[in-house]
Interface confidence: medium
């Protein structure tokens, strides 16, 4: 989109960025607003109701002034002009300040994460080298699902100290591969907490926990709820004994009956002796009948 180069009409040269400019035609804005003036007074643009097409002209002026990408002093004050930027524009930026990131996320607040925002976040995080606690705090405040949008490789750059910023709802959409990466970090982050406090913090990460950690939790009277149990890795649940599951769930063990057709409960039941299941008094069916020999095929494969 090119605006014809025309001379600025007499008396219309902009001395400052102010409300009078909303009455300028697009060609007048192009001709009468100095790009350097615009760059130094970017904070005013947000307070002036420029139209969609007028904003195109202002962006064009900034693009001409900064062909290599805008400086952070301009980026921080872009306001809703940010919505005009393409991912290609944003890739030219070097955003280092968390305040700048917050200012731009604020503009997009309440909307889905746009390609522009995704690019901005990517540039910011790569510039910092890791996803530190303050950044994670900010990102999850604006986008609760942000953490689960990262690949396991990207999550590996999250330092354990950042895990303190994670809220349970931030993990709602994480898949097992992501939790596999996050769980060891959470375990490390919360290691100095006592039993009940530790469980409250680690609970939402348990979808990445191995069998031995679940066995250890079963010794601590944690009373895990069924929703958490259903998110555990099937391979981590299968080796647990009936007694261990009973201790792990505490009073919530009764909920197993309602979930007996769903994984991981279904698969776990198939691995237990029916005698042992009967001790729960829940009427769980599908266990190994009495007198049958249980072969641990996984152990056999490992030996051969």
């Amino acid at each position: 989109r090119e605006v014809e180069k025309t001379a600025c009409p007499s008396g219309k040269k902009a001395r400052e960025i102010d409300e009078s400019l909303i009455f300028y035609k697009k060609w007048e804005l192009e001709a009468c607003v100095d790009a350097a003036l615009l760059a130094t007074q970017m904070d005013r643009v947000n307070a002036i109701p420029f139209t969609y097409e007028q904003l195109d002209v202002l962006k064009h002026k900034l693009d001409e002034l900064y062909p290599q990408g805008y400086p952070e002093s301009v980026i921080q004050h872009l306001g809703y002009l940010f919505l005009k930027m393409s991912p290609e524009d944003i890739r030219k930026w070097n955003v280092t300040s968390l305040e700048t990131l917050k200012a731009l996320l604020e503009v997009n607040k309440g909307h889905e994460m746009s390609p522009q925002v995704a690019t901005l976040i990517d540039r910011f995080v790569k510039g910092r080298g890791q996803l530190d606690k303050d950044t994670l705090d900010t990102l999850t405040a604006f986008y609760p699902g942000y953490l689960c949008s990262l690949s396991p490789e990207e999550l590996s750059s999250v330092p354990p100290s950042s895990i303190w910023a994670v809220r349970p709802q931030d993990l709602d959409t994480c898949d097992p591969r992501q939790l596999d990466v996050l769980y060891p970090k959470a375990r490390l982050a919360f290691q100095n907490m006592n039993g009940s406090e530790y469980f409250v913090k680690i609970q939402s990460f348990l979808g990445g926990a191995p069998t031995e950690d679940l066995k250890a939790l079963s010794q601590q009277n944690v009373s895990m709820d069924l929703a958490t149990f259903m998110k555990l890795r099937t391979d981590a649940v299968l080796p647990l004994t009936v007694a261990e599951v009973q201790k792990l769930l505490g009073p919530h063990v009764e909920g197993l009956k309602a979930e007996e057709r769903h994984r991981p409960v279904r698969d776990w039941i198939l691995r237990q002796r029916q005698d042992d299941l009967d001790t729960l008094g829940l009427g769980l069916q599908g266990g190994i009948p009495n007198g049958y020999l249980v072969l641990d095929l996984s152990m056999q494969e490992a030996l051969s």
């Epitope: 909303i22 009455f23 300028y24 035609k25 697009k26 947000n46 307070a47 002036i48 109701p49 420029f50 139209t51 969609y52 097409e53 007028q54 306001g79 809703y80 919505l83 503009v107």
Partner: nanobody
Framework: DVQLVDSGGGLVQAGGSLRLSCAAS????????MAWFRQAPGKEREIVAV????????YYAESVKGRFTISGDNPKNTVYLQMNSLKPEDTAVYYC????????????WGQGTQVTVSS
């Protein structure tokens, strides 16, 4: 295209209040700026207030600053003009308007609603 339907005008005593509404329809309403203009008998049409949907920024003519408030309800695609402390000189036909370009080109207009302020 954008269609605008304005309403809420009427007869009011000086010092009274009115609220005008403008319902906008069309595929890309959110990319338009909305405004209220007015035209008194024998006078030119003048801009009263402007709002930018996206940024929420506003503009007011000097004559109405502090008395009139323009606001938008994005989900409803409706713009309001709350008019307080009305004066006889506010008497005019008020028009809702929308543009993506500038207020001097490519502007869509509502049908107008009469506001009469009696002394």
């Amino acid at each position: 295209d954008v269609q605008l339907v304005d309403s809420g005008g009427g007869l009011v005593q000086a010092g009274g209040s009115l609220r005008l509404s403008c319902a906008a329809s069309g595929r890309t309403v959110s990319t338009y700026n909305m405004a209220w203009f007015r035209q008194a008998p024998g006078k030119e049409r003048e801009i009263v207030a402007v709002i930018n949907w996206t940024g929420g920024s506003t503009y007011y003519a000097e004559s109405v600053k502090g008395r009139f408030t323009i606001s938008g309800d994005n989900p409803k695609n409706t713009v309001y003009l709350q008019m307080n402390s009305l004066k006889p000189e506010d008497t005019a036909v008020y028009y809702c308007a929308a543009t993506r370009a500038s207020w001097t080109e490519n502007t869509y207009w509502g049908q107008g609603t009469q506001v009469t302020v009696s002394s």
